[in-house]
């Protein structure tokens, strides 16, 4: 029962995580204009992996796609690739895990096959989550680097009479969605791997051998030999520890500019 619960929970957590990774990848707010130096702007800029947007205080929002591949920074391409790989692996993992679910009967599928599929999907979720976390972290690192570079430029180029306010970008909502989603997918994957150990048939019962003691007709039958897995008693009634790992989904608040202003 605990195995089924762990597997089911792992599946649900991974499903939410992958939905989050997809949402983060599609979101436009990977980086948002830093309003520290100009909090009263009537024009608010934000950028995603696929397009950049400008929201005016009038309510008008204009988004432009990046219609070039070669002209984009290598880091952005790498982030895109990591997120897509994460989504693809996650989607395949979900497909595999559906068939691996203990509560779903498909023909006469053996427990060992379900265990293998559960492990496969678990590993896929773990890699998917890691890809998402890596992608978001690479983008965040890129933002931090650019932020401090533009800050340095701001204070070196102030010699003239005319002020040119350079647009600096800070973390957008998508980064937080991506981190949380990647973490959830990772946790879901770990749970699937734990569930797999509970599904695997661990008992190899050797055939009973009769030992005839001289002068006696009493047969001695030794008990079934346990395969040394480090887990305890009978597989059929096995209970594995359900740690009930929880993540607190913190809602990250960041300056949302106007209504588009």
């Amino acid at each position: 029962m605990a195995v089924t619960a762990c597997q089911g929970l792992g599946f649900v957590v991974s499903l939410i995580g992958i939905a989050g990774i997809i949402a983060a990848t599609c979101m436009d707010q990977w980086s948002t204009q830093d309003l520290y130096n100009n909090p009263v702007t009537a024009v608010f800029n934000y950028q995603g992996l696929w397009r950049s947007c400008v929201r005016e205080s009038s309510g008008f929002t204009e988004c432009r796609g990046y219609f070039t591949l070669l002209g984009l920074p290598a880091m952005l391409q790498a982030v895109r690739a990591l997120m897509i790989v994460g989504i693809v692996l996650g989607a395949i993992g979900l497909l595999v895990s559906i068939f691996a679910l203990k509560c779903i009967r498909i023909g006469s599928m053996e427990d060992s096959a379900k265990a293998n599929m559960t492990l496969t999907s678990g590993i896929m979720f773990i890699v998917s989550g890691l890809c998402a976390i890596a992608g978001v972290s690479v983008f965040a690192n890129m933002l931090v680097t650019n932020f401090w570079m533009s800050t340095a430029n701001m204070y070196t180029g102030m010699g003239g009479m005319v002020q040119t306010v350079q647009t600096r970008y800070t973390f957008g909502a998508a980064l937080f969605v991506g981190w949380v989603a990647g973490g959830l997918t990772l946790i879901g994957g770990v749970m699937m791997c734990i569930a797999c150990r509970g599904l695997a048939p661990e008992e190899t019962n050797y055939k009973a051998v009769s030992y005839h003691a001289s002068g006696h007709s009493v047969a001695y039958k030794p008990g079934g030999f346990k395969a040394s897995t480090g887990f305890g008693s009978n597989t059929k009634n096995k209970k594995i520890y359900d740690g009930g790992a929880r993540t607190e989904d913190e809602v990250q608040s960041y300056p949302s500019k106007h209504d588009y202003v």
Epitope: Q33, N45, S57, F60
Partner: antibody, heavy 119, light 113 residues
């Protein structure tokens, strides 16, 4: 057809208060930011205040900050400007205008209401 | 705050001649995000309310005659009336719509010589 009609202007003594209203029609009022702009007799245009569509962002000119309060009632399609501690230099024609167009441009303007601050 | 300096204060031009109004900003009004300049031009005819002529520094509002042209970028902007007509007699204002407060220029009065 977009229409903005201001009301509430009049003669008031220095230090007094007045509340201007702007009734909007012909467009989805709740979707657009609104502005108050004034013009003193024989002078140029002076931007006074702005309120975003959901009242989340509000800005004022330095000359009126702390004395004027902008507000809106989207249910009534109305914009308001509460003017307190009025001074002689606040005498002007007050226009309400909407950022209905691209580029934050003030596309539609009302006909204006005259506020005279005098003893 | 952004300070807009308009010049000249007034301008007398013969019918059919070119009229040029300058507007200089104390800060750049150029937005990198969409490569647009957030400066707007308005026309106010005597006894009337202001009307929008040009937004994004150079984009004519639909219905505005093509003799009105906006140009410039960053801090220096120009409104040109290529062939002045009698109905163009008005005061012209530039406005910063990039950051609050949305300041106006002092205005340029265009008259017929």
């Amino acid at each position: 057809e977009v229409q903005l009609v201001e009301s509430g202007g009049g003669l008031v003594q220095p230090g007094g208060s007045l509340r201007l209203s702007c009734a909007a029609s012909g467009f989805t009022f709740s979707s657009f930011g609104m502005h108050w702009v004034r013009q003193a007799p024989g002078k140029g245009l002076e931007w006074v205040s702005y309120i975003s569509s959901g009242s989340g962002s509000i800005y004022y000119a330095d000359t009126v900050k702390g004395r004027f309060t902008i507000s809106r009632d989207n249910a009534k399609n109305s914009l308001y400007l509460q003017m307190n501690s009025l001074r002689a230099e606040d005498t002007a024609v007050y226009y309400c205008a909407t950022s209905y167009y691209y580029g934050n441009a003030l596309e539609y303007w009302g006909q204006g209401t005259t506020v005279t601050v005098s003893s | 705050d952004v300070v807009l300096t308009q010049s000249p204060d007034s301008l007398a031009v013969s019918l059919g001649e070119r009229a040029t109004i300058s507007c200089k900003s104390s800060q750049s009004l150029f937005n990198v995000g969409n490569q647009k300049n957030y400066l707007t031009w308005y026309q106010q005819k005597p006894g009337q309310t202001p009307t929008l002529l040009i937004y994004w520094a150079s984009t004519r509002k639909s219905g505005v005659p093509d003799r009105f042209t906006g140009s410039g970028s960053g801090t220096d902007f120009t409104l040109t009336i290529s062939s002045l007509q009698a109905e163009d007699v008005a005061v012209y204002y530039c406005q910063n719509v990039y950051s609050y407060p949305l300041t106006f220029g002092a205005g340029t009065k265009v008259e017929i010589k």
